[in-house]
C-alpha cells in the first residue's frame, strides 16, 4: 500500500512530504527544506514555510495610521535559518556573509552588517496591521458583516483565537485587520499571529498553503470580497534599530 492510499497528507501545509515513517509506522509529515516534522493539525511556522518555499523546485478616520516604528517586509523572500522549534533565528545571514537581525515574523529590524553583528534575542512582533484595498463593488460592505466574516475566517481557517483579532476597520475601499498578541498572552498551542497573517497573505495572493483546499473565497453576505492590494505592517515589542541614513532615505 502507498502513503497516498492511507491519506498520509498534511491538510494545513502543502509544502511537506508525508511518509508512513513515524513511530510505529504512523504518518509523519516533514517540511521541505528543513526536514522538520510538522504538526498538521495547526499552522506551520512562517520560518519553516519560507524555508520550504525557497527549497521547493523552481517552480479622524477610523483607519489606523501605522506607528513610526512599524515595519514593512521590503526585503522579500530569503532562505531563513530556523531554530529547532521552527522559529526564526534572531540573526539571519546570506551566502555572502551579510547578516541582519529579524523579529519573530522574520522581517529585518536592523541595518545589514557582517558576521560580527549580534542579535541578542528574537524580538516578538506583538501587533500586526493588515491593510487591504478591495476591488470596487456596487456599494460599501456593511461594516459589522465584514467584521464578522473576517473574524470567522481567522478563527476557522487559521485557527487563531478570536481574542487576538483586536479590531477590523473599514473605510471603503480600505479594510484594516489588527492582530495583537503579547508574549504573555500566547499560551501553548495558540496559533501565532505572524503565522496566521502569513497564511492569510498567501491566501489573498491566490497561493494557498492548505493542502487540496480550494483557494480563499471571501464573501460578505454573498458578495465576493476581492482584494487588489495588501500591505502588512509589523510592530515589535522593542522598536527596531535602523540608522538615520535609512530613516531619511
Amino acid at each position: 500500500h502507498t502513503a497516498a492510499q492511507d491519506n498520509c497528507t498534511c491538510p494545513t501545509n502543502k509544502m511537506t512530504v508525508c511518509s508512513p515513517d513515524g513511530p510505529g509506522g504512523r504518518c509523519q509529515c516533514r517540511a521541505l527544506g528543513s526536514g522538520m516534522a510538522v504538526d498538521c493539525s495547526t499552522l506551520t511556522s512562517k520560518c519553516l514555510l519560507l524555508k520550504a518555499r525557497m527549497s521547493a523546485p523552481k517552480n479622524a478616520r477610523t483607519l489606523v495610521r501605522p506607528s513610526e516604528h512599524a515595519l514593512v517586509d521590503n526585503d522579500g523572500l530569503y532562505d531563513p535559518d530556523c531554530d529547532p522549534e521552527g522559529r526564526f533565528k534572531a540573526r539571519q545571514c546570506n551566502q555572502t556573509s551579510v547578516c541582519w537581525c529579524v523579529n519573530s515574523v522574520g522581517v529585518r529590524r536592523t541595518d545589514k552588517g557582517d558576521l560580527s553583528l549580534r542579535c541578542d534575542e528574537l524580538v516578538r512582533t506583538h501587533h500586526i496591521l493588515i491593510d487591504l484595498r478591495h476591488r470596487p463593488t456596487a456599494g460599501a460592505f456593511n461594516h459589522s458583516d465584514l467584521d464578522a466574516e473576517l473574524r470567522r475566517l481567522f478563527r476557522e481557517r487559521y485557527r487563531l483565537h478570536p481574542k487576538f483579532v483586536a479590531a477590523v476597520h473599514y473605510e471603503q475601499p480600505t479594510i484594516q485587520i489588527e492582530l495583537r498578541q503579547n508574549t504573555s498572552q500566547k499560551a501553548a498551542g495558540d496559533v501565532d499571529i505572524g503565522d496566521a497573517a502569513y497564511y492569510f497573505e498567501r491566501d489573498i495572493k491566490g497561493e494557498s498553503l492548505f493542502q487540496g483546499r480550494g483557494g480563499l473565497d471571501l464573501r460578505v453576505r454573498g458578495e465576493p470580497l476581492q482584494v487588489e492590494r495588501t500591505l502588512i505592517y509589523y510592530l515589535d515589542e522593542i522598536p527596531p534599530k535602523f540608522s538615520m541614513k535609512r530613516l531619511t532615505a
Partner: antibody
Framework: QVQLVQSGPEVKKPGASVKVSCKAS????????LGWVRQAPGQGLEWMGN????????NYNEKFKGKVTITADTSTSTAYMELSSLRSEDTAVYFC?????????WGQGTLVTVSS | DIVMTQSPDSLAVSLGERATINCKSS????????????LAWYQQKPGQPPKLLIY???TRESGVPDRFSGSGSGTDFTLTISSLQAEDVAVYYC?????????FGQGTKLEIK
Amino acid sequence: QVQLVQSGPEVKKPGASVKVSCKASGYTFTDYWLGWVRQAPGQGLEWMGNIFPGSAYINYNEKFKGKVTITADTSTSTAYMELSSLRSEDTAVYFCAREGSNSGYWGQGTLVTVSS
Amino acid sequence: DIVMTQSPDSLAVSLGERATINCKSSQSLLNSGNQQNYLAWYQQKPGQPPKLLIYGASTRESGVPDRFSGSGSGTDFTLTISSLQAEDVAVYYCQSDHIYPYTFGQGTKLEIK
C-alpha cells in the same frame, strides 16, 4: 522483508566520477525517504543527503553540495549516489539507508577507493 | 548545523556490568508539535552497517534486547546497557534527525574490561 542492496566496490582515479546504486525491495520505494551516509576509514558517520523518490525531492548536506548528486529510478526501485571530481579524501564506505523514526534499514555499504 | 557530542570517546566495562554513553546536542531535538525527541542510537560492528537500537530517544527497535535502553529529552540523552554481553562490543553513535542536515555524534567505542 525490507532490503537495500548496494553495488560492489569501486576503485577510481583522482578526478574521475563514480555512481553507487542502492536497490530497494520489500516496501513501497516511493513512500520513504532514502538517505546516503559516508564513513571514511576509521572515522564516524556523515549524512550526505536524501531523496524522496515519490516526488524526487532531494536535500544535500551543504558540505557535499557540488560533490554529490542523488537520483532515483522509481521503475526499478533503485537510488543512485554519484560522486564527481574524486580525490583521495573521498575514499570511504558509502551506505544507503531508509530514513524514518523506526526505519532501521541500511545497505551493506560500498567501498569507494580513490587512488592514482 | 546541530552538533552532537558523545562522551566518553571510549569505554571499558566488565561483562555483566552497566555501560552508559552520553550524547549532548547543541540544540534541542524535542519537536514541540508532537513532543517527540528526534534522537536515535546505532550500534556498529567492524565491517557492518550501523544497526538501529533506539529511536525517538527511548523507543527500542523491534528485536533489540531489553538490556538496551535510551533516555533523555531536549539536548541531553543517554544510552544504557544494563548488563554488558560480549556481543555488545562495538562503536555506538547517536544521531539527530530533527532538522537538516542530520548529524551523528563522533562515536563511542565500547570494549570489555
